[in-house]
Interface confidence: low
């Protein structure tokens, strides 16, 4: 059977194009190594935003020029993507793999829809 | 059967190290964590740490670093727990404990508990 | 970390009767676990990941709820029942227990 994933329905990027929330799998948090990944859906396609992994010692490292940071807690990782435009705007799905030791476990969470509003352009001054 | 064997009752000094072991068996040792949990007479319970026994690293309850060092021997399928500058405040009962499995996790199994005394 | 509140403290439930143990998280947190520890003896499980009983556990036990608050109930008591009752959360570390509930039986 599939393992559980638990993220929230729906976030507001803030005005910079940053959006942040939590990803939980129910599982023990207890892994010695778990992978994390962003994927955004947009109609029938899938694409990977973002990935990272982490052990219960090392923190979750995200490539340096990542679009997504993120901390891990037990079961619990908070993530935040950056740079978001309005043509961001769409389903992130949160995919949480529990790679080693044996058994592997996979967990798909619903989605969280994420609404990127761009700012309107600042008037020129003189 | 999932079992964890404890080792016997401990008796120390105030300033002395104790090491509890917990034996396991009727499972493959380094598919799962071993969790200690303390609990000092009357009260609640409270999670030491964990470790990996494929891997051997350790999570910590920051209340116990430095108190407490896991540890595992594969070949024996024998998790260890060492208590270092032993004082009162640390007579308790000492569980080991072990996840239902890897899907749903809980503590399923313990161990049957070592009881740690420190008197001089 | 996650601090873990249990209500009541303890109760003194009849035979028969139903008895109900509230656990409250310092924060949200995924699944709750609950423990029973009869006196001498190790925790056994009793309800994981929330709502699910474990292996051998009558079905006099459930449990239920979300967030920060949750559950714990037994429709009708029976004297085998008497113990401490515990709630665990495995949300973030470290993991951390409530701080027990004793039901004794009137």
């Known amino acids: 059977k599939g393992m559980h994933a638990a993220q929230p329905a729906v976030v507001l990027a803030s005005s910079r194009g940053v959006a942040s929330f939590v990803c939980e799998y129910g599982s023990s948090g207890n892994a010695a190594e778990v992978r994390v990944t962003m994927l955004r859906q947009a109609g029938s396609q899938m694409t990977e935003v973002c990935a990272a992994t982490y052990t219960v010692e090392d923190e979750l490292a995200f490539l340096d020029d990542s679009t997504c940071t993120g901390t891990s807690s037990g079961n619990k990782v908070n993530l935040t993507i950056q740079g978001l435009r309005a043509m961001g705007t769409g389903l992130y799905i949160c995919k949480v793999e529990l790679m080693y030791p044996p058994p592997y476990y996979v967990g798909m969470g619903n989605g969280t829809q994420i609404y990127v509003i761009d700012p309107e352009p600042c008037p020129d001054s003189d | 059967e999932v079992q964890l064997v404890q080792s016997g009752a401990e008796v120390k000094k105030p300033g002395a190290s104790v090491k509890v072991s917990c034996k396991a068996s009727?499972?493959?040792?380094?598919?799962?964590?071993m969790d200690w949990v303390r609990q000092a007479h009357g009260a609640s319970l409270d999670w030491i740490g964990n470790?990996?026994?494929?891997?051997?690293?350790?999570s910590y309850n920051q209340k116990f670093k430095g108190k407490a060092t896991l540890t595992v021997d594969k070949s024996t399928s024998t998790a260890y727990m060492e208590l270092s500058s032993l004082r009162a405040g640390d007579i308790a009962v000492y569980y080991c404990?072990?996840?239902?499995?890897?899907?749903?996790?809980?503590?399923?199994?313990w161990g049957q508990g070592t009881l740690v005394t420190v008197s001089s | 970390q996650i601090v873990m509140t249990q209500t009541p403290l303890s109760l003194s439930v009849s035979p028969g009767e139903p008895a109900s143990i509230s656990c409250s998280a310092s924060?949200?947190?995924?699944?709750m676990h609950w423990f029973q520890q009869k006196p001498g003896q190790s925790p056994q499980s009793l309800i994981y990941?929330?709502?699910i009983l474990a292996s051998g556990v009558p079905d006099r036990f459930s449990g239920s709820g979300s967030g920060t608050d949750f559950t714990l109930k037994i429709s009708r008591v029976e004297a085998d029942d008497a113990g401490v009752y515990y709630c665990?959360?495995?949300?973030?570390?470290?993991?951390?227990f409530g701080t027990g509930t004793k039901l004794e039986l009137k």
């Open positions: 470790i990996n026994p494929n891997s051997e690293s350790t």
């Open positions: 404990t072990r996840d239902g499995n890897r899907y749903d996790a809980w503590f399923a199994y």
């Open positions: 665990q959360q495995r949300t973030s570390y470290p993991l951390t």
């Open positions: 009727g499972y493959t040792f380094t598919d799962y964590n």
């Open positions: 924060s949200s947190v995924t699944y």
């Open positions: 990941s929330t709502s």
